[in-house]
């Protein structure tokens, strides 16, 4: 009597990454009968939602439904109709919403409530929208890259999937940079994790992992820039801010109310004798770098060693995948090659920041000016964060791999989040059936 279409032998999952600056929808696909195998889930689509992050809809929540429409409709096109009702949808909001919640729990709840109602209107298996913790964001990013690199597989391969893949089972560390926060996650070498908040224990595929993670709220590239501006305007003699992190000839008017809108600038807030100020770029990498370092408090550390702001950081260990804005910024600056040393990166940043704004605009005519203007700051910030913040050195720089995608899937927390929520990463090593992995035969 039932004529419900037989499901394909594949399954799908949807994760929306509601970041501080924008929302992206990811569609994943995997063979139904190999759910517990490592490395079988892959991304089939990414849809970037037009507009800002969801936290910006706080005064216009009625627009959230329309905002999400195009990408949700794209999901309906990509995923076969017969699979829609069985396809889980998860939305995870990150630091932009963490900041909104700090300002007002009620407003954050209202935004999430409208997001939930909008997403539940689609014919998918909507599983909820929530603000994930910084610890989760770090952990899921670490799971994603190691899953995609095949680090959880007990089978050793005689070939390499990706150029930077070492043939051992040593996991990669994860470095994630967003607009409002940044995460560092890795397995330290025989080192006690001195602060319980930064310690994670996983048992994955029959192996135990003791993982260090920390998320630095307000140290994503956008919030770090707001912090720097708020810090620097304190000592400006008038409403002109001569800023070394912007190209010579660049000018932009900033509202003081916008500057102090974010909780990230509260520590620098003061009454200013003007409502607006003008940034005037002077394009000096060294001075920009120095200004950024003032955002990192390294004078206090209650542990054997710290990153900054009194946060414990064990000695760096092994290779690291640096993704999200670490990758996008360095890719734009053409600095993602494994062959580019830290000294060369610094040299190129000096040249880039010193280029006149008019010249930059001509060279990159297709790039939105808002983004284009901030690459000097962002590139300098990445160097400062990695070198002085996380204590990478010229030598250990070669262990940082700037990664956009691995095997066609974006590096980021979303895949790890879905793998966890769909119970696709078993604690124990599944019993493999003969010839189930054609690659290994």
């Amino acid at each position: 009597t039932q004529n419900k279409a037989l499901p394909e032998n594949v399954k799908y999952g949807i994760v929306l990454d509601a970041g501080s600056s924008h929302t992206s929808l990811y569609i994943y696909k995997w063979p139904a009968e190999k759910e517990n195998d490592t490395g079988v889930v892959h991304q089939v689509e990414e849809c970037r939602v037009k507009g800002p992050g969801i936290s910006k809809f706080v005064q216009k929540v009625n627009e959230i439904g329309i905002y999400l429409t195009d990408c949700m409709e794209r999901a309906r096109e990509v995923i076969p109709r017969s699979q829609h009702q069985e396809t889980p949808v998860y939305l995870g909001a990150t630091a932009g919403m963490r900041l909104l919640r700090m300002e007002s729990e009620e407003l954050a709840d209202r935004v999430l409530d409208v997001v939930e109602r909008s997403l539940s209107n689609y014919p998918f298996d909507f599983q909820g929208a929530r603000i994930i913790t910084g610890q989760e964001e770090g952990a899921y990013g670490w799971i994603t890259i190691n899953y995609l690199l095949g680090k959880f597989s007990q089978k050793t391969r005689w070939f390499s999937i990706v150029p930077y893949e070492t043939n051992n089972q040593e996991t990669f560390g994860a470095l994630d940079l967003g607009g409002a926060s940044t995460q560092v996650t890795f397995v330290p070498q025989n080192q006690t994790i001195e602060s319980p908040d930064n310690a994670l224990q996983f048992r994955l595929y029959g192996k135990d992992y003791n993982v260090y993670t920390h998320s630095f709220l307000c140290y994503g590239k956008d919030q770090a820039l707001w912090q720097k501006l708020a810090k620097d305007i304190q000592v400006a003699s008038n409403e002109i801010l001569r800023d070394p992190c912007f190209h010579p000839g660049y000018k932009k008017v900033v509202n003081v109310s916008d500057l102090y809108k974010t909780p990230c600038t509260k520590r620098f807030e003061m009454t200013l004798p003007f409502q607006q100020f003008e940034i005037q770029g002077i394009g000096n990498y060294q001075q920009c770098h120095q200004s950024i370092l003032e955002l990192f408090n390294t004078s206090y550390c209650p542990y054997s060693q710290c990153a900054f702001n009194g946060i414990f950081l064990p000695p760096l260990q092994g290779d690291f995948g640096a993704f999200s804005a670490f990758y996008f910024v360095m890719k734009f600056l053409n600095l993602t090659s494994e062959k580019v040393s830290q000294e060369k990166v610094t040299e190129m940043m000096k040249k880039f920041c010193a280029q006149p704004w008019e010249e930059i605009k001509t060279s990159y005519a297709g790039v939105k000016e808002k983004y284009l203007s901030e690459y000097c700051f962002s590139g300098t910030y990445i160097l400062s964060l990695l070198l002085q913040g996380y204590h990478f050195t010229a030598d250990s720089w070669e262990h940082i791999h700037f990664i956009g995608k691995i095997q066609g899937s974006d590096a980021g927390w979303t895949l790890g989040y879905m793998l966890n929520l769909t119970n696709m990463i078993p604690a124990e090593q599944p019993l493999s059936t003969p010839l189930s992995h054609s690659t290994y035969v």
Epitope: T1, Q2, N3, K4, A5, R81, S82, H84, Q85, S120, N121, P123, D125, F126
Partner: antibody, heavy 121, light 107 residues
Framework: EVKLEESGGGLVQPGGSMKLSCVAS????????MNWVRQSPEKGLEWVAE??????????HYAESVKGRFTISRDDSKNNVYLQMNNLRPEDTGIYYC????????????WGAGTTVTVSS | DIVMTQSPAILSVTPGDRVSLSCRAS??????LHWYQQKSHESPRLLIK???QSISGIPSRFSGSGSGSNFTLSINSVEPEDVGVYFC?????????FGAGTKLELR
């Protein structure tokens, strides 16, 4: 045989309440989204409410005209779906059909015979 | 909400005629359009799903076409038992909405 059977209709005064029931047979009830659709000479066919599955946390959706007044619910152990109607208005008068979709979603390949609700003083 | 508009409201036919019933959506709904037949004193019955997909048990003289916002239900040789009201339905997004119907009657 796949079958839906509604009950609970009748005459009710404006502002009153009424609960409609629908019992399903011939298919695995707990696996399918259930709906109520009504029909009146004035408004024609009108979708009223939908309830999804346990795995969807029994998510519900309503037509704007009944939101806040009507509640759809289900009892998978009894193969029943219900429509609790409060603060009834004359414009709620009509034949109420229990419907489902055994094949995919958002169309109705199984309909009950309907139960008539009259809201009048 | 997506508004479904059907035309004509009434269609008088002779057995053996080929007829076309029209349905227009107020916005694009891809192929998420379904057709129903309702005979006097009966519940509606699904005729066509997803604009053109046939339903088992429905005579092959019924066919559907269209995509986006314009759709057509065709009956290639009308039989006397086809008398009734034909409704189209938006199955694209909530709220699900129906057209007002086309009444098919014999001349």
């Amino acid at each position: 045989e796949v079958k839906l059977e509604e009950s609970g209709g009748g005459l009710v005064q404006p502002g009153g309440s009424m609960k409609l029931s629908c019992v399903a047979s011939g298919f695995t009830f707990s696996k399918y989204w259930m709906n109520w659709v009504r029909q009146s000479p004035e408004k024609g066919l009108e979708w009223v409410a939908e309830i999804r599955l346990k795995s969807n946390k029994y998510g519900t959706h309503y037509a704007e005209s009944v939101k806040g007044r009507f509640t759809i619910s289900r009892d998978d152990s009894k193969n029943n779906v219900y429509l609790q109607m409060n603060n009834l208005r004359p414009e709620d008068t009509g034949i109420y059909y229990c419907t489902t979709q055994l094949d995919l979603y958002w169309f109705f390949d199984v309909w009950g015979a309907g139960t008539t609700v009259t809201v009048s003083s | 909400d997506i508004v479904m508009t059907q035309s004509p409201a009434i269609l008088s036919v002779t057995p053996g005629d080929r007829v076309s019933l029209s349905c227009r959506a107020s916005q694009s709904i891809s192929d998420y359009l379904h057709w129903y037949q309702q005979k006097s004193h009966e519940s509606p019955r699904l005729l066509i799903k997803y604009a053109s997909q046939s339903i088992s048990g429905i005579p092959s003289r019924f066919s559907g076409s269209g995509s986006g916002s314009n759709f057509t239900l065709s009956i290639n040789s009308v039989e006397p038992e086809d008398v009734g009201v034909y409704f189209c339905q938006n199955g694209h997004s909530l709220p699900l909405t129906f057209g007002a119907g086309t009444k098919l009657e014999l001349r």
